[in-house]
């Protein structure tokens, strides 16, 4: 069967969708790929919790899965001929969308070494137990299945879609229904974050009565890294309800006028944004969130902040503190690189000295230069070294081969050398289009 029921969770800059259906790993990846994503990564405990949430949502909708121990494909696979590496967290497996090897793993049991066939990873769910954040689904590896034969207990798969940013859900100040259509062709009425390029259809009214108005918005980038719908004020407002319906759709305070009209407001230390609904801190840097040598930088319109590090340092995983950058990893030096706090130092090998074109360059030391030659007679400079020679009738001698000694002729002959919606996938991209547009055969344009 194909992929059926789906659930969706959007958080940060990614959305996860869970699908039921007995598909092979390749068919599941193709399904995710068609909509601009990949089988999901589980690169951290936090990501494992997001994936667990979307699976829990799917299981609430799905009436009955056939197996007590159900498996859902994720995007971790090992190609045929690539062997198990027990020393690595991913054991030699890699994420289908590419990306770095990550330290997080949650294997179900010790893996058997088998290089003769491709192996794929699924999440193992014990449906007899409730899904708890403390009990994250284990990783189970096995055959990748084939069309019509997905593998034992395979009940579905999880996709991941990455975005430039997300919009807040639209605020309704009165009765109505919002339907979001995402770029990965999922429709939902309840998303805690709505991905860039999603469309929102708002139908105002009580439902059974005639709808009074409808609105259409797109989640777009309004300014650099500022994602918004472009709607102004709460939607579907009704004098009948005033602030009593969903706090008037206001983020913080709702103020009613005598005629049933109302305005949104903000608590002290906050200000109302252009959408006339949302409140943002007047200065998120005032609480000094950045630590160590990090400086707090306000985002546009004072909406958010980012910590910034001095040169030679970078933000740690908390994004609040600075750690030294190992500049030597980028090989900035021609020869030897020594990492130092906040910087680095280039050094040259024996036989070389600092100099030449470019930063960190080394040039050959001319050991044969006048007054410097270590040779008793002839001296020839070479790259990084030198060699001595002797006049006719003499041969090189001495432990270091710099001296010349006479040849006894009576004894006989002594004898180295790469030149605007968009989804993001590793190594490629997939172009996507806004609702109402279709991807052209060239895979780039929208028509």
């Amino acid at each position: 069967t194909g992929a059926d029921t789906e659930a969706v969770v959007c958080v940060g800059t990614a959305c996860y969708t869970a699908h039921s259906g007995k598909l092979s790993a390749a068919e599941a990846q193709n399904h995710c790929n068609q909509n601009g994503g990949n089988l999901a990564t589980v690169k951290s405990k936090e990501e494992a919790q997001h994936v667990q949430r979307v699976l829990a949502q799917l299981l609430r909708r799905e009436a009955a899965l056939t197996a007590r121990m159900s498996k859902f494909w994720i995007g971790l696979q090992r190609e045929k001929g690539k062997c198990l590496d027990p020393s690595l967290p991913l054991k030699g497996f890699s994420w289908v969308g590419g990306g770095e090897d990550t330290p997080y793993s949650n294997w179900h049991k010790e893996l058997r070494n088998s290089c003769i066939s491709k192996r794929c990873v699924s999440l193992l769910l014990d449906l007899s137990q409730p899904l708890l954040p403390s009990r994250l689904p284990k990783w189970s590896e096995g055959p990748c299945g084939s069309p019509g034969s997905p593998g034992s207990n395979i009940e579905g798969f999880v996709c991941k879609f990455s975005f430039k940013g997300m919009c807040r859900p639209l605020a309704l100040g009165g009765p109505g229904q919002v339907t979001y259509t995402t770029p990965f062709q999922t429709t939902s009425s309840s998303l805690e974050a709505v991905p860039f390029a999603s469309a929102a259809n708002v139908a105002c009214g009580e439902g059974d009565k005639d709808e009074t108005q409808s609105h259409y918005f797109l989640c777009k980038e309004k300014a650099p890294d500022v994602f918004d719908w472009g709607s102004s004020g709460p939607l579907c407002v009704s004098p009948k309800y005033g602030c009593n319906f969903n706090n008037g759709g206001c983020h913080q305070d709702c103020f009613e006028g005598g005629d049933g009209s109302f305005l949104c407001g903000c608590r002290p230390g906050f200000r109302l944004l252009d959408d006339l609904v949302t409140c943002a801190s007047r200065n998120p840097c005032s609480s000094s969130p950045c630590r160590g040598g990090a400086t707090c930088v306000l985002g546009p319109h004072g909406k958010n902040y980012t910590c910034r590090c001095p040169q030679g340092y970078q933000l740690d995983s908390s994004q609040l503190d600075c750690v030294d950058v190992d500049e030597c990893q980028d090989s900035p030096c021609a020869q030897e690189c020594v990492n130092t706090p906040g910087g680095f130092r280039c050094e040259c090998w024996v036989g070389y000295e600092p100099g030449g074109p470019g930063e960190g360059a080394c040039q050959d030391v001319d050991e044969c230069a006048l007054g410097r030659s270590p040779c008793a007679q002839g001296c020839t400079n070479t790259d990084g070294s030198f060699h001595c020679s002797c006049e006719e009738g003499y041969v090189l001698a001495g432990e270091d081969g710099t001296q010349c000694q006479d040849v006894d002729e009576c004894v006989g002959p002594g004898g180295p050398l790469c030149d605007s919606l968009c989804f993001n996938t590793q190594g490629s991209f997939h172009c996507g289009c806004l609702p109402g547009w279709v991807l052209a055969p060239n895979g780039v344009s929208c028509t």
Partner: antibody, heavy 118, light 112 residues
Framework: QVQLVQSGAEVKKPGSSVKVSCKAS????????LNWVRQAPGQGLEWFGR????????DYNGKFKGRVTLTADKSTSTAYMELSSLRSEDTAVYFC???????????WGQGTTVTVSS | DIVMTQSPDSLAVSLGERATINCRFS???????????LYWYQQKPGQPPKLLIY???NLASGVPDRFSGSGSGTDFTLTISSLQAEDVAVYYC?????????FGGGTKLEIK
Amino acid sequence: QVQLVQSGAEVKKPGSSVKVSCKASGYAFSSYWLNWVRQAPGQGLEWFGRIYPGDGDTDYNGKFKGRVTLTADKSTSTAYMELSSLRSEDTAVYFCVRGDGYWAMDYWGQGTTVTVSS
Amino acid sequence: DIVMTQSPDSLAVSLGERATINCRFSKSLLHSNGITYLYWYQQKPGQPPKLLIYQMSNLASGVPDRFSGSGSGTDFTLTISSLQAEDVAVYYCAQNLELPWTFGGGTKLEIK
């Protein structure tokens, strides 16, 4: 290739309105912001608004708010700029300009000269 | 609104010489994402402006590499390393960090 073709020059009386069109081709019209910029004779450039044709979302320079209306017709990939209550200082060349993914104004229309004179 | 001051108003440089145009903003254009939203445009007589440099230092498609952009959060420079006759134009800096987008007053570049 991307092209923005604007309507012809206009001569208007003070107090009247003018509507300039900008027909886009060669790209997904609905997916890019379309900006309007004007340039008075011998003067610099002044941004006065933009529209996102996908959903009609608009932003205006506060200096012109209330006098300018931006609209877009997705079916013909055409954007319109209407400026009302014209005065002599509105005499300028009006450009429509596409905003790209890097927030640059990458493609410009040829410009429409609007002359306001009694 | 973010205000900008472009200098000089006009500039005369000999062919083959270096030309430098400056732009100063009332607020840092460095976004918390590390990108500086500063742009340079070139306008020749009777033509619409043309994008030269985006995000402070990136050359737009088809722009000769004698053009370069540099700067910090508030102070920026457009440099033409070796002036050519076809570079005679008015140059504008602009910011696209915060609405309303704003332009500098322009610098008229001529040949000495």
